[in-house]
Amino acid sequence: VPRWRQQWSGPGTTKRFPETVLARCVKYTEIHPEMRHVDCQSVWDAFKGAFISKHPCNITEEDYQPLMKLGTQTVPCNKILLWSRIKDLAHQFTQVQRDMFTLEDTLLGYLADDLTWCGEFNTSKINYQSCPDWRKDCSNNPVSVFWKTVSRRFAEAACDVVHVMLNGSRSKIFDKNSTFGSVEVHNLQPEKVQTLEAWVIHGGREDSRDLCQDPTIKELESIISKRNIQFSCKNIYRPDKFLQCVKNPEDSSCTSEI
């Protein structure tokens, strides 16, 4: 008789999840010499231990602590780029501006980026059929708790001027329910962080509005100011030109506003 399996609303674990995590860890330790002390099998064991045999709606930050410890990494605290709903451009930016880091440029963020995973209570199986959806099933699922944990730690580590890239094409440019709005904003440390600088990325070619005046940006400014952190905002009217100018800052067309 086949064992009854919980059917969740979200997609199941990414296929070849264990192999993918291990391979990403190997690649990361090759690319980042300062992380060559990391044992990738220990990392996978700790990752697995966070969710295997546990109810996928009952995961805690504590479950991820062994993995957090193994993935401890020092990034320059004044070179942190946060993002919300505009991951691809943020990653393109840090690939060019090599001294700046998104969460996905760190080992733990790199390991889990774009992956889904969950287990089942009391079995050592990985559930490849379905995993809990944050809205429809539960918020304390393995993926959500992982990102909440690493995002909190990443924001806590930030200092000086912290940058955030926001998507100006969204109805809510700043969304209080995003990871940035619900976790990172509230874990920036006022005693270390002087300024949060928002870069609002425009979508339309002819969009010349000042999106820094958007009500949601004003809401962000209010939250940040109440936390005794200064706030500044810049419009990035031409993201393609913006990236090009990061690559070639000497280009004569890069002196004008982008």
Epitope: L22, A23, V26, K27, E30, I31, H37, D39, Q41, S42
Partner: antibody, heavy 120, light 112 residues
Framework: QVQLVQSGAEVKKPGASVKVSCKAS????????VHWVRQAPGQGLEWMGV????????TYAQKFQGRVTMTVDKSSSTAYMELSRLRSDDTAVYYC?????????????WGQGTLVTVSS | DVVMTQSPLSLPVTLGQPASISCRPS???????????LNWYQQRPGQSPKLLIY???KRFSGVPDRFSGSGSGTDFTLKISRVEAEDVGVYYC?????????FGGGTKVEIK
């Protein structure tokens, strides 16, 4: 499956240089460092150094510093080890070995070895 | 450099009988990441070395379960529970905790 295929045997004169190749297949070459280890006739194993193909950065054993050069050609998934100013005690079988998945400084799969004979 | 002292040098064994090889590093092999990188390699006659055991006691994929590793501190052991004809060769311990990586002198396992 993971395979490391090395170049053929070489006979060299003292003072000359030798360059041994190691062609990798069955895995993503740039993601795994390549170690070089040698074994003198009837002797044990001696680690020479390691190269990371992604950036080409190297770590050499102190003993070989200044005489060994490890390089890679990413386009052909090949690692090279060149040893200069050869002496008769450099006569050995030279092995390349892939870094172990778990840890940068461990090795899992090895090439078949290349015998280098240094003789006048 | 870490000196790896292996014993015995030669080990004549009867087929089906157990065999045990000792390895003593000159210093602790506990890495700053908490792992102990003590490995065992098998080199059959005319072949290149093959990884048997890594991190003291973990068997590499495809290695028969008659091979086991144990130990801690500066005292490590490789055991073959029942020696088979294909186990003939030289066994090396190695450490990859400290650079340069170093190997033991080898133990030759032969059939009596």
């Amino acid at each position: 499956q993971v395979q490391l295929v090395q170049s053929g045997a070489e006979v060299k004169k003292p003072g000359a240089s030798v360059k041994v190749s190691c062609k990798a297949s069955g895995y993503s070459f740039t993601n795994y460092a390549v170690h070089w280890v040698r074994q003198a006739p009837g002797q044990g194993l001696e680690w020479m150094g390691v190269i990371s193909p992604y950036y080409g950065d190297t770590t050499y054993a102190q003993k070989f510093q200044g005489r060994v050069t490890m390089t890679v050609d990413k386009s052909s998934s090949t690692a090279y080890m060149e040893l200069s100013r050869l002496r008769s005690d450099d006569t050995a079988v030279y092995y390349c070995a892939r870094r172990f998945e778990g840890f940068y400084y461990s090795m899992d799969y090895w090439g078949q070895g290349t015998l280098v004979t240094v003789s006048s | 450099d870490v000196v790896m002292t292996q014993s015995p040098l030669s080990l004549p064994v009867t087929l089906g009988q157990p065999a045990s090889i000792s390895c003593r590093p000159s210093q602790s092999l506990v890495h700053s990441n908490g792992n102990t990188y003590l490995n065992w390699y098998q080199q059959r006659p005319g072949q290149s070395p093959k990884l048997l055991i890594y991190k003291v006691s973990k068997r590499f994929s495809g290695v028969p379960d008659r091979f086991s590793g144990s130990g801690s501190g500066t005292d490590f052991t490789l055991k073959i529970s029942r020696v088979e004809a294909e186990d003939v060769g030289v066994y090396y311990c190695s450490q990859s905790t400290h650079v340069p990586l170093t190997f033991g002198g080898g133990t030759k396992v032969e059939i009596k």
